[in-house]
């Protein structure tokens, strides 16, 4: 903590300049009033500030907003913004695009993936809902920070929305927010034509139940083996080896080379061998044949 | 334009460990696999094993099992493969290289980056 | 594993000369899993054709491949001085993945 010491006369502050950058520590803690720093700060990201000096300004915000700052300061902090915890991050209410947006701009280039996302999180907080303008911001500012939210935050996408997602967007999305997205996806691209939709739906698929698989496997989509092994095991699993035939179209022999990757290895395991080898692939792993399958959690769930 | 970024060359003593991270850029890093590729000096190449970026699985060749381990930064677009206990039969050039999912072959090979493991 | 033996191990030839390298399979791969590569002395390996006998993007039309079952070869139809090199095939037909040893032409 920087020690306190009174401000010689000569140093008093009256307005935030580049003279400050001569200051030290000490008299930067001493002949900076806070009130005054966040009035004027949108002067500060223009001065060249040492890290040093930047950590002084950041304690003298800190103790004039113990609860958080406001977001006259906040929009203003430019490259103060890389000194921010996500604590400090999560006392703040932020409802402007154009503060999320210089924000994401100072932080491009800097590891602060954890700032970003509390970043977010607070402006989702703040406007209340996952709307289309904060949807477009995040694409265009921050590729992949969509991904950062929490299920919880993202369920408040309205379907609406889901088409200004692109499919670089949700690269980083993991199993439980594509559970959430894939049923707003399907209720926004509903009335699409079967190709059409296929594109659209494509990148959402990780969140696909089983039966919409099937469905899918029906429309003579030929999915890629990208896509594939993006699907939830669960989904994969229960589908016949016909099923996956007609999915995967001509994409089908791709089986070969991820046989060892799951989710194909473990569908493998439960297919029958005489079933894999209809494929012609040389996949090795089925049931043999004339072995029973006996489905214990079937049993369990009876007893 | 796609490109695959190794780290410069690395000498470590014998049995340390060595971690070489493999930037992508220029596509979709989760549409491909990363397998990684050692060439002993003037010799042949040998198949390591590969992480699908995507769901972060992992295949190993049985003789680099335990040898390799091989982790994925999705937000970083970045790969690392681990080499554990090295000694001299470890000194090579290790290769990342891109393989689309559910294809065998290596479009776009990485720089390559030297491990030299020396006392 | 399947081990793939290509021979020569060393050859030369002049500008303008038809080039064949073969490449050799312990046992049977399905031909749309075997690929070929390019390497030059520094460089990291180029594709140079996939799936037994399509050329990747960008090599020169003079670059051929064919075979099946456990012979494959490529074929270079007029030798030029910047086909100097070392050439690798490649299977993904049967687990663990494998390289063959090497072919290094040199031009004369």
């Known amino acids: 903590d920087v020690e306190r010491t009174t401000c010689p006369p000569e140093k008093e502050v009256h307005e935030i300049d580049e003279s400050l950058i001569f200051y030290k520590k000490r008299e930067l803690e001493a002949c900076v009033d806070a009130a005054l720093l966040a009035a004027q700060m949108d002067r500060v990201d223009a001065i060249p500030f040492t890290y040093e000096q930047l950590d002084v300004l950041k304690h003298k915000l800190d103790e004039l907003y113990p609860q958080g700052y406001p977001e006259s300061v906040i929009r203003h902090l430019g490259h103060l913004f890389l000194k921010m915890s996500p604590e400090d991050i999560r006392k703040w209410n932020v409802t402007s695009l154009e503060t999320l947006k210089a924000l994401l701009k100072v932080s491009k280039g800097h590891e602060m993936s954890a700032q970003v996302a509390t970043l977010i999180d607070r402006v989702v907080v703040g406007r209340g809902q996952l709307d289309k303008d904060t949807v477009d911001t995040l694409t265009a500012f921050c590729p992949g920070c969509l991904c950062s939210l929490s299920p919880e935050r993202l369920s408040s996408v309205p379907p609406s929305v889901i088409g200004a997602v692109r499919p670089q967007d949700l690269d980083t999305c993991g199993p439980r927010q594509l559970d959430v997205l894939y049923p707003k996806a399907r209720l926004a691209f509903q009335n699409m034509s079967g190709s059409e939709y296929f594109v659209k739906i494509r990148p959402f698929l990780g969140g696909a139940p089983t039966e919409d698989v099937k469905a899918l496997s029906q429309q003579n989509v030929s999915m890629d083996l990208a896509t594939f092994m993006k699907l939830r095991r669960e989904a994969v699993l229960p589908l016949t080896v016909a099923e996956v035939q007609k999915l995967l179209g001509p994409h089908v022999e791709g089986l070969k080379v991820e046989e060892q990757h799951s989710p194909v290895r473990d569908w493998i395991l439960k297919q029958r061998q005489d079933d894999l080898d209809t494929l012609g692939l040389g996949l090795q792993g089925g049931i043999p044949n004339g072995y029973l399958i006996l489905d214990l959690s079937v049993r369990e769930a009876l007893s | 334009e796609v490109q695959l970024q190794q780290s410069g060359p690395e000498l470590v003593k014998p049995g340390a460990s060595v971690k070489i991270p493999c930037k992508a850029s220029g596509y979709t890093f989760t549409d491909y696999n990363m397998d990684w590729v050692k060439q002993s000096h003037g010799k042949s190449l040998e198949w390591i094993g590969d992480i699908n970026p995507s769901t972060g699985g992992t295949i190993y060749n049985q003789k680099f099992n335990g040898k390799a381990t091989l982790t994925e930064d999705k937000s970083a677009s970045t790969v690392y493969m681990e080499f554990r206990s090295l000694t001299s039969d470890d000194t090579a050039v290790y290769y990342c290289a891109r393989r689309r999912i559910g294809t065998g072959y290596f479009d776009v090979w990485g720089t390559g980056t030297t491990v030299t493991v020396s006392s | 594993q399947i081990v793939l033996t290509q021979s020569p191990a060393l050859m030369s030839a002049s500008p303008g000369e038809k080039v064949t390298l073969t490449c050799s399979a312990s046992s049977s791969v399905i031909s749309s899993y075997l690929s070929w590569y390019q390497q030059k002395p520094g460089s990291s390996p180029k594709l140079l054709i996939y799936?037994?006998?399509n050329l990747a993007s960008g090599v020169p039309a003079r670059f051929s491949g064919s075979g099946s079952g456990t012979s494959y070869s490529l074929t270079i139809s007029s030798m030029e001085a910047e086909d100097a090199a070392s050439y690798f095939c490649h299977q993904w037909s049967s687990f663990p993945y494998t390289f063959g040893g090497g072919t290094k032409l040199e031009i004369k």
């Open positions: 799936r037994t006998s």
